[in-house]
Structures are given as C-alpha cells and as structure tokens.
C-alpha cells in the first residue's frame, strides 16, 4: 500500500542497545505509516570472524532503496555495519548477505522466540 | 499544521536551573518522541537527549546526564527540559525536535528555539 | 561517541553552481545519516534522512548518498535560498551527534 491511504505493517523488533537507549530490547514492533508513505522492515547486524552480532531491527521510514524487496538482502561488499530491508510483515526475520560482486550467499536464522507486541 | 511551540528567553545566574516548554499540536503527541539539541552562539548543534512521550523513559546524552531532567504532560501534549546547575557555558539556543519512533529516527519538526542566558 | 566531520567547513558558490558537502563518521553508522539546513536565527530543518531519503516538501536539487562512514550532500543547481549552513547528524547510537556544519557563502 502506501498509495492514498495510511499503512500498517509489523516488522520485527531488536535493539542491542536498549538498556542506553531505554527502549524495549525485543518484540514486534507495529509501524503506523503516514499518508502516501510506505513503510519497511529492517535489520542490521555485525560479522566478525562469522560471529553475527545482531544490532537493530525495527521499522523503517520511507525508502525508496527498500522498495518492492520482498527479502531482506544486505548487498555491500563488506561493511562495519550490514544492512538490509524488505517489504511485507516480518520480513526481517530472516536475513542475508548477498553482495552485488559476488560471493557466498550467507542466510542468518533466527533462534525461536515468542516476541511481544510493543507498544 | 504540525507545530512546536516553545517558550520565551530566559536569563539565570550560575548555579540556577532553568525549564523549558515545548508544546506540540497538528499530531497525535504519543506517536513520536521528542530531542532537545542546543547551539551555543556562533558553534554546532548538540544533542542533549530524548524523550518518549508514550512510556515516559529518557535518555540523556553523558555529558548532561546528573543534570538534564525531560518530562512530559500528556494532557497539554508538552515537554519539558530542566537543565540545573548552569554555568556560563550553558548559555545557547535550546530547541526541541520532533522524532520519528522508526528508524533511522530523523528530526522532522523543529521549534522555533529557546534563548537561554547564564550570566552574573 | 561517534565522531561526525564535515568538510570543508566553508564553501563559496554562485548561484547555479554544484555543490557537494562531505560527512565521515567514526565508526560505521550504516545508513543512520540525516542531513539539515540551518539559516541565521532560524531553527534546523531536516533534508535527508536514512543517507539518501529526501524529506517531503524539499526541492529535488538536494540529493544525498553515501553508507557506512561516508557520506555526500550534493546540491545541484545552487539557488539564492540555499546559502546557508548544512549538517549532517547520526542517530546510530547514542549519544546522537552532529558534524561541525558547512557555511555555503555567496562568491
């Protein structure tokens, strides 16, 4: 959506910063768009040593570089930090690093959990 | 329209603190969280924390920390800043920023700044 | 803290011109980049978010790029309402910090 009308999307929620930043470290987060304004999933995350570090899920604003991306794909080569975004509820669940000049495709699985609603 | 109201100019002594409003109107007040920044004359911006009016929880940049007190009213759809102990180097332009609650969390509405004057 | 810096930290243009302004964090901050103007007297107003959004309302000569550590504000046509001083700011991690601004005078 996000043509005329207000959108509503859930994404997955993580912070692994949250006890600074004072906000929830998990859930799901329920995102309330503006009018005319899509809305995204994200997910970000560390790889060190292939040691995943996950940094933050959430929602995200408006992009055009998330739209129509049904997954969530990380393309730089190899960056700090990786990033991806996707459209559709919980698209950020599941992650993965594809970078555009080749290489392993490397999909991260997230452990079972049984998310609560924030609010 | 969407809004930021702050209020007047104030001028204090060292050791004193100062309070200042900001209230929201044009959007629902709970579904976006709030940032103070300040501006000294002549330098940058300086984030001095956040607020999030839907819960209440804080968080204050380190150097304000022990210092900076952000509360909110619901009811009036107002923030507040405390800022205690002042000395001259607090004297700067204070305003209050709308926040988006997603990420990546940009300062989208901004009042229209507060002047704040520390001097014997 | 992540440390934000601008360059240069003034940049004299003509009307018409193509100005470009350059941001480098610390630490990589993904694409947690917003870009603001500032005009003397006046509050800050947001241009870009997310490194390369451009917020509603703001002309399409504003264009910004960039992930990671660095990052471009890029101005393509400078227009008379444009002289003033940009900032690019990151919201990562707290504490959220700004770069040191970039004065854009009239040659």
């Known amino acids: 959506s996000g043509r005329g009308e207000a959108e509503t999307r859930e994404c997955i929620y993580y912070n692994a910063n949250w006890e600074l930043e004072r906000t929830n470290q998990s859930g799901l987060e329920r995102c309330e768009g503006e009018q005319d304004k899509r809305l995204h999933c994200y997910a970000s995350w560390r790889n060190s040593s292939g040691t995943i570090e996950l940094v933050k899920k959430g929602c995200w604003l408006d992009d055009f570089n998330c739209y129509d991306r049904q997954e969530c794909v990380a393309t730089e080569e190899n960056p700090q930090v990786y990033f991806c975004c996707c459209e559709g509820n919980f698209c950020n669940e599941r992650f993965t690093h594809l970078p555009e000049a080749g290489g392993p495709e490397v999909t991260y699985e997230p452990p079972p959990t049984a998310p609560t609603l924030l609010t | 329209q969407v809004q930021l109201v702050q209020s007047g100019a104030e001028v204090k002594k060292p050791g004193a603190s100062v309070k200042v409003s900001c209230k929201a109107s044009?959007?629902?007040?709970?579904?976006?969280?709030m940032a103070w920044v300040r501006q000294a004359p002549g330098q940058g911006l300086e984030w001095m924390g956040i607020?999030?009016?839907?819960?209440?929880?804080?968080s204050y940049a380190q150097k304000f920390q022990g210092r900076v007190t952000m509360t909110r009213d619901t009811s009036t759809s107002t923030v507040y800043m405390e800022l205690s102990s002042l000395r001259s180097e607090d004297t700067a332009v204070y305003y209050c920023?709308?926040?988006?609650?997603?990420?990546?969390?940009?300062?989208?509405?901004w009042g229209q700044g507060t002047t704040v004057t520390v001097s014997s | 803290d992540i440390q934000m810096t601008q360059s240069p930290s003034s940049v004299s243009a003509s009307v018409g011109d193509r100005v470009t302004i350059t941001c480098r964090a610390s630490?990589?901050?993904?694409?947690?980049l917003a870009w603001y103007q500032q005009k003397p007297g006046k509050a800050p107003k947001l241009l870009i978010y997310?490194?390369?959004s451009l917020q509603s309302g703001v002309p399409s000569r504003f264009s910004g790029s960039g992930s990671g550590t660095d990052f471009t504000l890029t101005i393509s046509s400078l227009q008379p309402e444009d002289f003033a001083t940009y900032y690019c700011?990151?919201?990562?991690?707290?504490?959220?910090?700004f770069g040191g601004g970039t004065k854009v005078e009239i040659k």
């Open positions: 630490q990589g901050i993904s694409r947690w």
């Open positions: 997310a490194a390369s």
């Open positions: 920023a709308r926040v988006s609650m997603y990420a990546p969390e940009p300062m989208d509405v």
């Open positions: 607020i999030r009016p839907s819960v209440g929880s804080t």
């Open positions: 044009g959007y629902t007040f709970t579904s976006y969280n």
């Open positions: 700011q990151q919201a990562f991690s707290h504490p959220w910090t």
